[in-house]
């Protein structure tokens, strides 16, 4: 016996209670593919979630985060509170980056300053909570005997500004 359900298009479901008639999805539900025996409940964007795209009979709603929050996970499955630059979100809220680390975004974690000496370079601009250090020429390039087509910019002593 031929399965009549395969003829049911997206936006409908195959109603076994009605001799496999294709019935439209009820309000607040959808079916994105044909041949479905049930419609899925639409996603609701509540609380810190706001609606980016309304649910239709053939596609689920899409959510975004309200101002002050940003999306995490596939299809914005979570909303996480923003922090200020120079901070990270911990179990106890937004906390300033520890000395020697920075965060130049409203999200994510504080990351260590670049270690210029690992690349044989010197610190040109000190790091802050919001900005990484800027590495300059290597100390050897700055020595008086070193030949250079253009004189290098004066470099600061390695070290970091207090927070």
């Amino acid at each position: 016996l031929q399965d009549l359900c395969s003829n049911c298009p997206a936006g409908t479901f195959c109603d076994n209670n009605r001799s496999q008639i294709c019935s439209p999805c009820p309000p607040n539900s959808f079916s994105s593919a044909g041949g479905q025996r049930t419609c899925d409940i639409c996603r609701q964007c509540k609380g810190v979630f706001k609606t980016r795209k309304e649910c239709s009979s053939t596609s689920n709603a899409e959510c975004d985060c309200i101002s002050g929050y940003h999306c995490l996970g596939a299809e914005c499955s979570m909303c996480e509170q923003d922090c200020k630059q120079g901070q990270e979100l911990t179990k106890k809220g937004c906390k300033d980056c520890c000395f020697g680390t920075f965060n130049d975004q409203k999200r994510g974690i504080c990351r260590p300053w670049t270690n210029c000496s690992l690349d044989g370079k010197s610190v040109l601009v000190n790091g802050t909570k919001e900005r990484d250090v800027v590495c300059g020429p290597s100390p050897a390039d700055l020595s008086p005997g070193a030949s250079s087509a253009t004189p290098p910019a004066p470099a600061r002593e390695p070290g970091h500004s207090p927070q």
């Epitope: 996603r43 609380g47 810190v48 995490l72 979570m78 509170q81 979100l89 179990k91 106890k92």
Partner: nanobody, 122 residues
């Protein structure tokens, strides 16, 4: 069907106290973490406090030592005791499930109440 119903909001003078309640139904309350959030025109939406199923509590800095979150699993209710209220605590307060267990983070599967207005003014 999951339901969260807040109550206890109202008008209070600065320095006063209020106790918000959130009655939960439609899910296993005793094993669920719960949270309170508030929404103000100025600061937007703010995570206020959370409580794990084991009773561990968390607060945002601005309410620490003034607000206390608690739960009564027998009554399926979570509370927010608010003392030493300030005008800047004026907001709509929402109760929500807190599946992520992470400060300032909610998931799409979390459920929300309709909110209760708290106004702190002389």
């Amino acid at each position: 069907e999951v339901q969260l119903v807040e109550s206890g909001g109202g008008l209070v003078q600065p320095g006063g106290s209020l106790r918000l309640s959130c009655a939960a139904s439609g899910f296993t309350f005793s094993s669920s973490a719960m949270s309170w959030a508030r929404q103000t025109p100025g600061k937007g939406f703010e995570w206020v406090s959370g409580i794990y199923s084991d009773g561990s509590t968390y607060y945002t800095d601005s309410v620490k030592d003034r607000f206390t979150i608690s739960r009564d699993n027998a009554k399926n209710t979570v509370y927010l005791q608010m003392n030493s209220l300030k005008p800047e605590d004026t907001a709509v307060y929402y109760c929500a499930t807190w599946g992520t267990l992470r400060f300032g983070v909610w998931a799409e599967y979390d459920h929300w109440g309709q909110g209760t207005q708290v106004t702190v003014s002389s």
